[in-house]
């Protein structure tokens, strides 16, 4: 079996995370997407999932996790909003076919919150390999007040990208006008 | 589809050793984790131990000194052994699958009785 | 180890509702999932699988069998009960290692 490496993300509690992960189109546009925890790194457990027809663009609401599948683009995108410390684990983009294995779409994210200061961000990025398809992160703090997870991002925003080619970072100002909407 | 058996003794001398395999179809033990639980006579479930996809092992504390899982790949079985066997081991034996942190199949379990 | 307590035993009319609970020693919940299933175990027989995540019907499983709860709380609601629903149940949890299980309830017609 491959095993894939581990993309590491450490943020602060109450950001929002969202994960871009792309598949391939001509195999997977008409399957099954999930988003997985694997508590115990060895058994997964399937937090949210696509909804049929998965040939239309299609958003899921699921407690603090978003789906939003869009086969056009050949995208799949996760968002985990208010994160806490007890969300911290290794995460996963797969195609669901149950009973049989899920396809796992990218390196397995490991997601470390903290407990931090609310006005200080600063992403710490381990690329560990690079493949052609790789995750799009963009990690976003959210006041308090805030209640949609859609809208442009506030600052202090970093937008981490690693598209194969190399890290981006993308702070402050230069983020102002970066949208979560896909 | 999915199906587990035990197979074993049914009668075992005190201080000998069990040995019991867990027969599995329709799915691959390389990619899903297969728990030993025990029950004595009118009592609950304890769990034993486990083997993992990756082949790496738990056990239960209270047996880890007694206890040892193993497998075979090519033929999809699952086996155990305990040795040092007492009467309090009298007890049906059951293995099942964990499938997303539930038991989703199990099988029909084999009744051991530590007897001389 | 988190413990699970049930109640020993519940007496029940045909065509009543039961309703069994199993409290935990602490929180089996992990990322908005609640990780307590419950059993159906008969004499003689392996555990059957009835509930999966607090509230999810095991495929096969009668409507009549539903989930509930959150945290440290949760029931197990059979209505109405029928004879053949004469059997010990067990609530287990998978949010903490080792994975558990209650004592058990049985299910005894009045």
């Known amino acids: 079996a491959i095993v894939l490496e581990e993309e590491r993300y450490d943020l602060v509690e109450g950001q929002t995370l969202t994960v871009k992960c792309p598949f391939n189109i001509m195999k997977y546009a008409n399957s099954q997407k999930a988003w997985q925890r694997l508590p115990d790194g060895k058994e997964p457990l399937t937090l949210v999932v696509t909804q049929r027809p998965f040939t239309r663009p299609s958003e899921v609401h699921m407690g603090k996790f978003t789906l939003k599948h869009d086969p056009s683009e050949a995208m799949l995108q996760v968002q985990m909003t208010d994160l806490q410390v007890t969300d911290s684990g290794l995460y996963r983009c797969v195609i669901y076919h149950p009973p049989n294995d899920p396809v796992v779409l990218f390196h397995p994210v490991r997601l470390v919150v903290t407990k931090g200061s609310s006005d200080v961000f600063t992403p710490v990025i381990i690329p560990i390999t690079r493949l052609t398809e790789r995750p799009i992160l963009i990690t976003t703090k959210y006041s308090p007040s805030d209640t949609t997870t859609t809208r442009s991002l506030p600052k202090p925003t970093a937008v981490v990208s690693s598209p194969g080619l190399g890290v981006t970072i993308i702070n402050g100002t230069d983020a102002d006008s970066v949208s979560t909407s896909s | 589809q999915v199906q587990l058996k035990e197979s074993g003794p049914g009668l075992v001398q005190p201080s000998q050793t069990l040995s019991l395999t867990c027969t599995v179809s329709?799915?691959?033990?390389?990619?899903?984790?297969v728990y030993w639980f025990r029950q004595p006579p009118g009592k609950g479930l304890e769990w034993m131990g486990n083997?993992?996809?990756?082949?790496?092992?738990d056990y239960n504390s209270s047996l880890k000194s007694r206890l040892t899982l193993s497998r075979d790949t090519s033929k999809n079985q699952v086996f155990l052994k305990i040795n040092s066997l007492q009467s309090e081991d009298t007890a049906t034996y059951f293995c099942?699958?964990?499938?997303?942190?539930?038991?989703?199949?199990w099988g029909q379990g084999v009744v051991v009785t530590v007897s001389s | 180890d988190i413990v699970l307590t049930q109640s020993p035993a519940l007496a029940v009319s045909p065509g009543q509702r039961a309703t069994l609970s199993c409290r935990a020693s602490?929180?089996?919940?992990?990322?908005?999932?609640?990780?307590m299933n419950w059993y159906q175990q008969k004499p003689g027989q392996q555990p059957k699988l009835l509930i999966y995540?607090?509230?999810n019907l095991a495929s096969g499983i009668p409507t009549r069998f539903s989930g509930s709860g959150s945290g440290t709380d949760f029931t197990l609601t059979i209505d109405p009960v029928q004879a053949d629903d004469i059997a010990a149940y067990y609530c287990?949890?998978?949010?903490?290692?080792?994975?558990?299980f209650g004592g058990g309830t049985k299910v005894e017609l009045k």
């Open positions: 602490q929180s089996v919940t992990l990322s908005n999932v609640n990780l």
């Open positions: 099942t699958r964990s499938w997303e942190y539930y038991f989703d199949h």
């Open positions: 329709g799915f691959s033990i390389t990619s899903s984790n």
């Open positions: 995540h607090a509230s």
């Open positions: 287990q949890q998978s949010g903490e290692s080792p994975r558990t």
């Open positions: 083997i993992w996809g990756d082949g790496s092992t």
